[in-house]
């Protein structure tokens, strides 16, 4: 079901079908017998009740006030009233641009990053059953697409994709042909989202341990969705059954980046685990960042300055 018209201020283009749907629709069905009224007020006219007799262009049914089509003189305030429920809209009908396939004031702007997924789908759920065909235009030139019911573009964005895309739905009502236009101004920008991934904390960490005990080395990074974080060490340590890399944890930051952490667990620490580098690496296509952990026997910790220890 089409959602109700909740926006109190609406701008539409003359000559197109248009509707207002009140937001107590489910309630109205429950109380069929309740009197429901639509009113318009504009300039000198205060609260004129609307009905199909007031204009051949107006249709009332269920929860909807329809205009076939909306015209400049339909500008004004509209009210829906039912018992103690009232909803109000302010409607501004603007002139159609006769020299273009769209009206500049009725354009939705979208910014798409180059190489990111870019999609335009021509849909109109409210008028869906009445639509004969739909065409998609780029800068007012018709695009030849397979589906003439819901033309769609789905691709990775390129700079050449920039432009004005207009979905034009053609529909019949009471023997007349109407069209509804929805235009998007698509701007393609450089990839602005990628950060240089960075590991958090000091680059070199000495960790005091006891032989036979376990240790958990935690590594955290701020990275992009495509980047990876992992532990690296000498090839000879790969077969050590006591070294365990735990599952990565990722949390999205408010800026759309990722905070990732990965734990390397070393159980039953042996001599072979001491004084070797356990490197945590964050890698992207642009480079890597690495921080190192060295396990040091607690008894030997007096030889190392205190500030380099991770406890």
């Amino acid at each position: 079901a089409e959602s109700c018209t909740s926006r109190p201020h609406i701008t539409v283009v003359e000559g197109e079908p248009f509707y207002l749907k009140h937001c107590s629709c489910s309630l109205a069905h429950e109380i069929e017998t309740t009197t429901k009224s639509w009113y318009k007020s504009s300039g000198s006219q205060e609260h004129v009740e609307l009905n199909p007799r007031s204009s051949s262009r107006i249709a009332l049914h269920d929860c909807v006030l329809e205009f076939w089509p909306v015209e400049l003189n339909d500008t004004g305030s509209y009210f829906f009233q039912m018992k103690n429920y009232t909803q109000k809209w302010k409607l501004n009908v603007i002139r159609r641009n006769k020299h273009s396939c769209f009206t500049e004031r009725q354009v939705t702007s979208k910014i798409v990053e180059v190489k990111k997924f870019f999609q335009i789908t021509c849909e109109n759920s409210y008028y869906q059953t009445l639509v004969n065909s739909t065409s998609l235009y780029k800068n007012c030139k018709k695009l030849l697409l397979e589906n003439n019911k819901n033309p769609t573009i789905k691709k990775n964005a390129e700079f050449e994709d920039q432009g004005y895309y207009s979905c034009v739905h053609f529909l019949h009502h009471n023997g007349k042909l109407f069209n509804i236009t929805k235009t998007f101004n698509i701007t393609i920008v450089e990839d602005r989202s990628n950060i240089v991934p960075v590991l958090l904390g000091p680059k070199l960490n000495h960790v005091a341990v006891e032989l036979g005990k376990n240790v958990r080395l935690n590594c955290s990074a701020l990275l992009n969705e495509e980047d990876v974080i992992y532990w690296m060490f000498g090839e000879e340590n790969g077969s050590d059954p006591n070294i365990h890399e735990e599952k990565e944890m990722r949390i999205m930051t408010p800026e759309g980046k990722w905070h990732a952490s990965k734990v390397l667990r070393i159980e039953n620490i042996g001599e072979s685990n001491l004084n070797v580098l356990y490197n945590c690496t964050v890698a992207s296509t642009g480079g890597t960042d690495t921080k190192s952990f060295i396990l040091v026997r607690k008894a030997d910790m007096a030889d190392i300055p205190g500030h380099v220890f991770t406890r």
């Epitope: 495509e226 992992y230 790969g238 890698a283 480079g287």
Partner: nanobody, 110 residues
Framework: EVQLVESGGGLVQAGGSLRLSCAVS????????MGWYRQRDLVARIWPGG??FYADSVKGRFTISRDNAKNTLYLQMNGLKPDDTAVYYC?????????WGQGTQVTVSS
């Protein structure tokens, strides 16, 4: 430019097996540590000398191997679980990543 082409994924019942392959062109494959990534999580890696290491989640079930003559990386996946369902990618380890390939989808049904 390095190209990574992963293949061998598919739909398999829990407990089943799959063998993934990754053909690598345009890089010093034999000198690089290579790895298999589940989405963006490194689950298996192999050193140039053949040493291997696995994430806990796949240890004992997955086996990574490489054929330096064919510039190909493999991942033998046994005892598959529904949790293993993901897109699998291969890439370098320890150096900047190559541009990701298209990956290969592995779906494990229960």
């Amino acid at each position: 430019e390095v190209q990574l082409v992963e293949s061998g994924g598919g739909l398999v019942q829990a407990g089943g097996s799959l063998r993934l392959s990754c053909a690598v062109s345009g890089s010093a494959f034999s000198r690089n540590v290579m790895g298999w990534y589940r989405q963006r999580d490194l689950v298996a890696r192999i050193w140039p000398g053949g040493g291997t290491f696995y994430a806990d989640s796949v240890k004992g079930r997955f086996t990574i191997s490489r054929d330096n003559a064919k510039n190909t990386l493999y991942l033998q996946m046994n005892g598959l679980k529904p949790d293993d369902t993901a897109v699998y990618y291969c890439n370098t380890v320890g150096i900047p990543l190559n541009a990701w390939g298209q990956g290969t989808q592995v779906t494990v049904s229960s």
